[in-house]
Interface confidence: medium
């Protein structure tokens, strides 16, 4: 699956006009603690992985979202699930992997060209559903939206990663968000944040660059849980 350098993780905080309803957070598989990493329909074996309970997407890593691991979205405990790749179904931006966002219920690539100058965004909206008309019709509407003509450089204030130049992402810095460099191989990254701690993370890191993922550094496996160091490593 192709992931571009740009990411829509910063969009996690926003309501989902393009991303769809935030409800129905079901998943294909149930967690098998310590062995399987559920989510995104892919089984991934992660070193010492324990399903991490969460209440919202912000408590999970940049390549995860928060949802119930039960099929069909029945209410229950929510855990951090692997993000969903391009062309997978989604209900909100946070479900899509870095470099993608949720559009019309599908994770699509937020490639650089998509955000250049004036773009046309096709969205599906409903009208008259349950109220003025009998049927709710899905209506394809073409919206012309002015985007930033000049991309934010490092340190520029931003709302989302698409506001930033190539190689940068939009991350929290104190109580605002600025464009920061996407992490390179070997750089320290943030993974599986504990409940509530994300709110304290006033210096948020970017995600790992293309072809890299945030994993426990090999020589830190024996370290205590609290001091485990995660770095960007080749897949």
């Amino acid at each position: 699956t192709l992931n571009s350098v740009l990411n829509s993780n910063a969009i996690k905080n926003l309501p989902p006009p393009l991303g769809g309803a935030a409800g129905h957070p079901g998943s294909a598989v149930s967690a098998a603690p310590g062995i399987l990493y559920p989510g995104g329909n892919k089984y991934q074996t992660i070193d010492n992985y324990q399903p991490y309970p969460c209440a919202e997407d912000e408590e999970c890593g940049t390549d995860e979202y928060c949802a119930s691991p039960t099929r069909g979205g029945d209410a229950g405990v929510q855990i951090c699930l692997a993000c969903r790749k391009r062309r997978k179904r989604c209900m909100r931006h946070a479900m899509c992997c870095p470099g993608n966002y949720c559009k019309n219920g599908i994770c699509v690539s937020s490639d650089q060209n998509h955000f250049r100058g004036e773009i046309e965004e096709t969205i599906t909206e409903s009208f008259g559903n349950d109220h003025s008309t009998l049927d709710g019709y899905s209506r394809r509407t073409t919206l012309s939206s002015k985007m930033y003509h000049t991309k934010g450089q490092e340190g520029s204030v931003c709302l989302r990663s698409s506001d930033c130049a190539s190689g940068l992402c939009c991350a929290r810095h104190f109580w605002s968000k600025i464009c920061k460099p996407v992490l390179k191989e070997g750089q320290v990254c943030t993974k599986h944040r504990r409940k509530g701690s994300h709110g304290l993370e006033i210096f948020q890191r970017c995600y790992c660059g293309e072809g890299l993922s945030c994993r426990i550094q090999k020589d830190h496996h024996q370290a205590s849980n609290s001091s485990r160091l995660h770095t960007c490593q080749r897949h």
């Epitope: 769809g20 129905h24 079901g26 069909g72």
Partner: antibody, heavy 119, light 107 residues
Framework: QVQLVQSGAEVKKPGASVKVSCKAS????????ISWVRQATGLGLEWMGW????????GYAQNFQGRVTMTWNTSISTVYMELSSLRSEDTAVYYC????????????WGRGTTVTVSS | DIQMTQSPSSLSASVGDRVTITCQAS??????LNWYQQKPGKAPKLLIY???NLETGVPSRFSGSGSGTDFTFTISSLQPEDIATYYC?????????FGQGTRLEIK
């Protein structure tokens, strides 16, 4: 119990349109996608597309793009599939199926609606 | 589109036999595969999801395995009520595609 009830068989002329309904009961209608799958006599299954009644998002297979429209009425838990510009090769049984949007598993199916296109 | 090829297209087996159907994807689909059973004149029924997970209420004689491009569906001990056509379905990429089906009959 959990079920999808589809409208009755239809006979149409080439070039006409057909609208098939699918009424859901026994589950939270807005918590799932509804997919439409068709099956011509003696042939396999062909996925036409899906819609999510909660968000109204739809996704159609390329083969049907421009000819198929999926709509819904949440108040009566019903989705509709309209296929236009019918041709003889559209003669098939059309199924609606409850679909989990994480793994696209179609775990509850309607009984199917037979659509015959003949001049 | 991802092509799904099932083999054999039909097979005949005796009650109690172990039956195996294979499904091959035209590209790597990880474990994004479901299996369905369709009896004559009826709608399909989901048996296996995510390549190897048994759907609720489905007898344990049905199982699935595989990942990547090669998948296997097995009935450990064939029962008379298992006479049907079986389909694999991929959901790794849109559009969703099905195999052409395998017709299973009793000898």
């Amino acid at each position: 119990q959990v079920q999808l009830v589809q409208s009755g068989a239809e006979v149409k002329k080439p070039g006409a349109s057909v609208k098939v309904s699918c009424k859901a009961s026994g589950f939270t209608f807005t918590s799932y996608d509804i997919s439409w799958v068709r099956q011509a006599t003696g042939l396999g299954l062909e996925w036409m597309g899906w819609m999510n009644p909660s968000s109204g998002y739809t996704g159609y297979a390329q083969n049907f793009q421009g000819r198929v429209t999926m709509t819904w009425n949440t108040s009566i838990s019903t989705v509709y599939m309209e296929l236009s510009s019918l041709r003889s090769e559209d003669t098939a049984v059309y199924y609606c199926a409850r679909t989990d949007y994480y793994y696209y598993g179609m775990d509850v199916w309607g009984r199917g609606t037979t659509v015959t296109v003949s001049s | 589109d991802i092509q799904m090829t099932q083999s054999p297209s039909s097979l005949s087996a005796s009650v109690g036999d172990r039956v195996t159907i294979t499904c091959q994807a035209s590209q790597d689909i990880s474990k994004d595969l479901n299996w369905y059973q369709q009896k004559p004149g009826k709608a399909p029924k989901l048996l296996i999801y995510d390549a190897s997970n048994l759907e609720t209420g489905v007898p344990s004689r049905f199982s699935g395995s595989g990942s990547g491009t090669d998948f296997t569906f097995t009935i450990s001990s064939l029962q008379p009520e298992d006479i049907a056509t079986y389909y694999c379905q991929q959901y790794d990429d849109l559009p969703i595609t099905f195999g052409q089906g395998t017709r299973l009959e009793i000898k």
